[in-house]
């Protein structure tokens, strides 16, 4: 006659986090008398998951009614699976005996892998703004996924980037993993409306990748170009001088007029016009009373943009 066999038909199963895992186990005989126990892992450090004889296992239910006469199905269902539940589960038959149970036979084991979705990617840019032609770094992080295989791509306005480095941690086996990637992006003057996108694809996402975005408007600073022009005379003694401040971003801008090096007026940009590329234009004008000046006047338009060192443009006003 054949001795009892413990049959675990599934070599491995994969379950999504939050779902239930069913671990199958049948025995071929009701003898010897004694309980079935389920363990995660093998050896002295194995973890007891379920004991037919005694104990309270709130997450575990048996698939069959173990009080039924002739029951040989000792499959269990573990609810609310998390990545921490991953491992190899063994169905073990014990033989009733004093002083303690004697392990009689073990199943071959079922490896449970847990599919856990990555967290939404978080993209962060540099702490300080940078100007066009400069290269800036963006980082993308996503956590808590399993299995380890994952694909990360970077895009700028729909165009895939190639200059990036990605790490998945830890390198060895773990219940869940994290990904960290750094991409280098060269800024252009047209990038105010641009977006950098980090896209993460994983088996748990069923072909619908997760995306994290960063707006380059948070990163870029486009310095203004200045033009000072003298307008036709308005009245006999007055000349209108304008300072055109063009193509700047962000809005924060302060303008100071200087007459022969002396501060004439300081104003903060208010009514701005926005360009299609997201930059701004602003114009300031100064009425100069020519009769108050005996000599030629040097008019300077000085602009401090976004806390940066001032830039200026001068215009010489001839007094005839």
């Amino acid at each position: 006659e054949e001795e009892l066999q413990v049959i675990q038909p599934d070599k491995s199963i994969s379950v999504a986090a939050g779902e239930s895992a069913t671990l199958h186990c049948t025995v071929t005989s009701l003898i010897p008398v004694g309980p079935i126990q389920w363990f995660r892992g093998a050896g002295p450090g194995r973890e007891l998951i379920y004991n037919q004889k005694e104990g309270h296992f709130p997450r575990v239910t048996t698939v069959s009614d173990l009080t039924k006469r002739n029951n040989m199905d000792f499959s269990i269902r573990i609810s609310n699976i998390t990545p921490a539940d991953a491992g190899t589960y063994y169905c073990v038959k014990f033989r009733k005996g004093s002083p303690d149970h004697v392990e009689f036979k073990s199943g071959a084991g079922t490896e449970l892998s847990v599919r856990a979705k990555p967290s939404a990617p978080v993209v962060s840019g540099p702490a300080a703004r940078a100007t066009p032609q400069h290269t800036v770094s963006f980082t993308c992080e996503s956590h808590g996924f399993s299995p380890r295989d994952i694909t990360l791509k970077w895009f700028k306005n729909g165009n895939e980037l190639s200059d990036f480095q990605t790490n998945v941690d830890p390198a060895g086996d773990s219940v869940s993993y994290s990904i960290h990637s750094t991409a280098k992006v060269v800024l252009t003057r047209e990038d105010v409306h641009s977006q950098v996108i980090c896209e993460v694809a994983h088996v748990t996402l069923q072909g619908d990748p997760l995306r994290g975005t960063a707006n380059l408007s948070e990163t870029i600073r486009v310095p203004p170009t200045l033009e000072v022009t003298q307008q036709p005379v308005r009245a006999e003694n007055q000349v209108n001088v304008t300072c055109q401040v063009r193509k700047f971003y962000p809005q924060r801008l302060q303008l100071t007029w200087l007459e022969n090096g002396n501060v004439s007026r300081t104003e903060t940009a208010s009514t701005l016009t926005e360009n299609k590329d997201g930059t701004y234009n602003w114009m300031s004008w100064l009425l100069v009373n020519v009769s108050a000046h005996r000599d030629d006047v040097k008019l300077t338009c000085q602009v401090e943009h976004d806390g940066q060192p001032a830039v200026s443009k001068s215009h010489d006003l001839k007094v005839s």
């Epitope: 006659e1 005989s29 009701l30 008398v33 029951n71 005996g97």
Partner: antibody, heavy 115, light 111 residues
Framework: RQLVESGGGLVQPGGSLRLSCTAS????????ISWVRQAPGKGLEYIGT?????ITYFASWAKGRFTGSKTSSTAYMELSSLRSEDTAVYFC????????????WGQGTLVTVSS | DIVMTQSPSSLSASVGDRVTITCQAS????????LAWYQQKPGQAPKLLIY???TLATGVPSRFSGSGSGTDFTLTISSLQPEDFATYYC???????????FGQGTKVEIK
Amino acid sequence: RQLVESGGGLVQPGGSLRLSCTASGFSLSSHGISWVRQAPGKGLEYIGTIGTGVITYFASWAKGRFTGSKTSSTAYMELSSLRSEDTAVYFCARGSAWNDPFDPWGQGTLVTVSS
Amino acid sequence: DIVMTQSPSSLSASVGDRVTITCQASQSVYGNNDLAWYQQKPGQAPKLLIYLASTLATGVPSRFSGSGSGTDFTLTISSLQPEDFATYYCLGGGDDEADNTFGQGTKVEIK
């Protein structure tokens, strides 16, 4: 589904006997067969359980004198060094106790030990 | 070895009565539930009524019920029927696989 015992009878003190328990309608291969006896006018007494190979065990008082074996259809129990106090009806039942209780039972076979 | 003590050893009751038989183990039975109840009528083999302390065997009328855990167990017949007059035995299992002991029996007779 039934069990039928046979092999009982009159035996002299010190003698031996082989009891059989034959299953009809089901297989014994995945079950133990337990033996229970009942002396005239007395209660039930567990003797032992016959499983596969090494999985055969007897109550402490029966060890040594009683042995057993089993095929897929018949279980056997050998009684040796019989004494007058072994006179009883011997029942076999399918099961090993706990979650595999004794059910069904055979009708019993009477063993009389007397000179 | 585990010792099972049944009480009473006999009782007289009428049809329709509620009957309770108790069984006490000298130590906790295996798994706190290795306790079965059997019914035996004269000249017949015993018949399984209850196992695992409270699980009703197939085909047994629902007037029979079992309860208890550890060392103290009860068989209850909620409304005694004429066919229930018999002797009832508990069978308790200890921690060793060969340690199975019957109680001495309770004879239920007609009053």
